[in-house]
């Protein structure tokens, strides 16, 4: 399986909310043995590979912000923890899977990575990640809704496996 | 914050199977993984194995035989048993939270378990 | 299973010095490697994650290298608190298995 950023770039007003999104391409193991572990984190794009290092989101871990659940079935996070931060991860039964954050700031301008961790017991952990930029913008250049930008054609899916 | 507590008997009997709880504060054990690690006395880390929340299994191939891990999230508590024990199972035992494609990052203080008659 | 080795089972330093230590894997592991870090009495405490990434709260002086069977992990200037033992740990696949150890000790 692969993960794809439908959007590379999100450019949002402050104050406005915005849901980033990662899809889970190709065939998922549904087996009794596999199950799937999801979330976000903020990274930077390092010299050795993008989204290796995890930073929280709003003073959020990546522990706190994760899914968890077998195949494509539905979830979301802790909703106390998450939406006192107004923050919500959620995940949908056709392998879309979200972060919204609601009232954004300066300070939420950065990348972000969706990780997707399929579990295969007794084997190993297949890892895939996505990345996506957004930036919150403040003043008279700022637009009046979050604007979003396809990934490019030539890496349209913005897939990175690992 | 998460904080892990074992307990169990300090003194197990050779041949005697080797009884330990682990208990999750602070958390919800509804996810991750959650390992068994032991240590003998100056001497390295071995992996045991894990449960998931999901109530999957794996362990250590060199255990497998002797191996039970379970978990009753009800008490949110995880439990080892390790049967037919001998003096090599003298250890420092640890459990653990281990993150799906990341680490070990939360650990119990450990509980030291002497196999003797 | 894999096979860490680390190297050399002690290192004699002083305080302010640079501790280089090194962990081997018998076949690669991409860079899913973790470094710990245990001193006597306690359990063992997470310092890097990913071959070079520091967990939360650890200091800049400890930092991590490496990819493939070849690992590093440097403290730049040793201070008092950071003579211990320190363990890498792989998870390309199951079992998890540790090194043997690097124990840092005061010269």
């Known amino acids: 399986f692969k993960v794809a950023t439908p959007y590379s770039l999100y450019v949002c007003p402050e104050g406005q909310n915005v849901t980033l999104t990662c899809r889970l391409l190709g065939p998922v193991d549904k087996g009794h043995d596999v199950t799937f572990y999801k979330t976000w984190y903020r990274s930077s794009r390092g010299e050795v590979q993008t989204c290796s290092e995890r930073r929280p989101i709003r003073n959020l871990t990546f522990q706190d912000l994760h899914l968890h659940h077998g195949g494509h079935q539905a979830a979301n996070t802790s909703h106390d923890l998450a939406q006192r931060h107004g923050l919500e991860s959620a995940s949908d039964h056709h392998g879309n899977f979200s972060i919204t954050m609601r009232n954004l700031t300066l300070l939420d301008s950065g990348l972000y990575c969706c990780l997707v961790v399929e579990i295969r017991h007794h084997h190993s952990e297949h890892r895939v990640h996505g990345a996506m930029e957004l930036q919150v913008q403040t003043g008279k250049d700022a637009p009046s809704n979050c604007v979003v930008y396809p990934s490019s054609s030539q890496d349209s899916e913005n897939i990175t496996a690992a | 914050q998460v904080q892990l507590q074992e307990s169990g008997p300090g003194l197990v009997k050779p041949s005697e199977t080797l009884s330990l709880t682990c208990t999750v504060s602070?958390?919800?054990?509804?996810?991750?993984?959650w390992s068994w690690i032991r240590q003998p006395p100056g001497k390295g880390l071995e992996w045991i194995g894990y449960?998931?929340?999901?109530?999957?299994?794996n362990y250590n191939p060199s255990l497998k035989s002797r191996v039970t891990i379970s978990v009753d999230t009800s008490k949110s508590q995880f439990s080892l048993k390790l049967s037919s024990v001998t003096a090599a199972d003298t250890a420092v035992y640890y459990c653990?939270?281990?993150?799906?494609?990341?680490?070990?990052?939360?650990w119990g203080q450990g509980t030291m378990v002497i196999v003797s008659s | 299973e894999i096979v860490l080795t680390q190297s050399p089972a002690t290192l004699s330093l002083s305080p302010g010095e640079r501790a280089t230590l090194s962990c081997r894997a018998s076949?690669?592991?991409?860079?899913?490697l973790a470094w710990y870090q245990q001193k006597p009495g306690q359990a063992p405490r997470l310092l890097i994650y990913?071959?070079?990434n520091r967990a939360t709260g650890i200091p800049a002086r400890f930092s991590g290298s490496g990819s493939g069977t070849d690992f590093t992990l440097t403290i730049s200037s040793l201070e008092p608190e950071d003579f211990a033992v320190y363990y890498c740990?792989?998870?390309?696949?199951?079992?998890?298995?540790f090194g043997g150890g690097t124990k840092v000790e005061i010269k």
């Open positions: 449960i998931y929340y999901s109530g999957s299994t």
């Open positions: 653990a939270r281990d993150i799906p494609a990341f680490a070990f990052d939360i």
């Open positions: 602070g958390g919800s054990i509804s996810s991750y993984y």
């Open positions: 076949q690669s592991v991409s860079y899913y």
């Open positions: 990913d071959a070079f």
């Open positions: 740990q792989h998870r390309i696949n199951w079992p998890l298995t």
